[in-house]
Interface confidence: medium
């Protein structure tokens, strides 16, 4: 299906969750002129990108764990 990119959002679809062991890093983009929604973009250990649903409880736990891990290093 064709997807028209409205605004400049990078997440056109989102995953509800992903295994933490597959994630290298997570970038949380706040809403702005470029995009009206919060975007959670995970960089996977295989180098690929995946957009995660910021409203998903599983994703929120992943973000919390990764941020906590980063602050303890």
């Amino acid at each position: 299906a064709s997807v028209v990119t409205e605004l400049r959002c990078q997440c056109l679809q989102t995953l509800q969750g992903i295994h933490l062991k597959n994630i290298q890093s997570v970038n949380v983009r706040s809403p702005g002129p470029h995009c009206a929604q919060t975007e959670v973009i995970a960089t996977l250990k295989n180098g690929k990108k995946a957009c995660l649903n910021p409203a998903s409880p599983m994703v929120q736990k992943i973000i919390e764990k990764i941020l906590n891990k980063g602050s303890t290093n």
Partner: antibody
């Protein structure tokens, strides 16, 4: 073959107007954002404006805000840049560029992967 | 606005050399950065997207790396056709901004 062809450039006096066109072919035009980028003589690249696939969202550099208007006609596969109140500092080669780049189903990046050949605009009295 | 600063502004090198160009963003842009090559009188050409991904058809001697604020473009074993001007560009937020360019010249 994916192609972009600009037209409409030329010599115009300060304060004058010009409309640039960019004819697209070889891809589904309405699906992709498009940008205008300019390059003054001997200078670097400067992004001017962008427009979303449907035309519903537009973006401008501060240097052209209020003077330039980007638009598109998806039925004609054409991108436009209406330039009003032109100044000497607007003198440049103007390029249109396609913002392509789907990576995975869940992530999209915006890269100017196809460019036109450029059309020169000279603002001088 | 996000400022992009490239260094060096110009660079002289010989065929076969390994060259590195750096680009620094005024704030973190994740890996939302591209590299373009431009030859005199021609339109720019996309080389690297998202900091480290090689655009289709671009020779493997080109590579990109970096994330956050610091990025590099490396050309291994320079070829005669590589002498050109190189630009980085961020798309993390609008206005989109380019670096000032790095002119790569033959020594």
């Amino acid at each position: 073959e994916v192609q972009l062809l600009e037209s409409g450039g030329g010599l115009v006096q300060p304060g004058g107007s010009l409309r640039l066109s960019c004819a697209a072919s070889g891809f589904t035009f309405s699906e992709l954002s498009m940008s205008w980028v300019r390059q003054a003589p001997g200078k670097g690249l400067e992004w001017v404006s962008a427009i979303s696939g449907s035309g519903g969202s537009t973006y401008y550099a501060d240097s052209v805000k209020g003077r330039f208007t980007i638009s598109r006609d998806n039925s004609k596969n054409t991108l436009y840049l209406q330039m009003n109140s032109l100044r000497a500092e607007d003198t440049a080669v103007y390029y249109c560029a396609r913002e392509g780049g789907r990576l995975e189903p869940y992530y999209y990046y915006y890269a100017m992967d196809v460019w036109g050949q450029g059309t020169p605009v000279t603002v001088s009295s | 606005d996000i400022q992009m600063t490239q260094s060096p502004s110009s660079l002289s090198a010989s065929v076969g050399d390994r060259v590195t160009i750096t680009c620094r963003a005024s704030q973190s842009i994740s890996d939302n950065l591209h590299w373009y090559q431009q030859k005199p009188g021609k339109a720019p050409k996309l080389l690297i997207y998202d900091a480290s991904n090689l655009e289709s058809g671009v020779p493997s001697r080109f590579s990109g790396s970096g994330s956050g604020t610091d990025f590099t473009l490396t050309i291994n074993s320079l070829q005669p056709e590589d002498f050109a001007t190189y630009y980085c560009q961020q798309y993390y937020s609008t206005p989109l901004t380019f670096g000032q360019g790095t002119k790569l010249e033959i020594k």
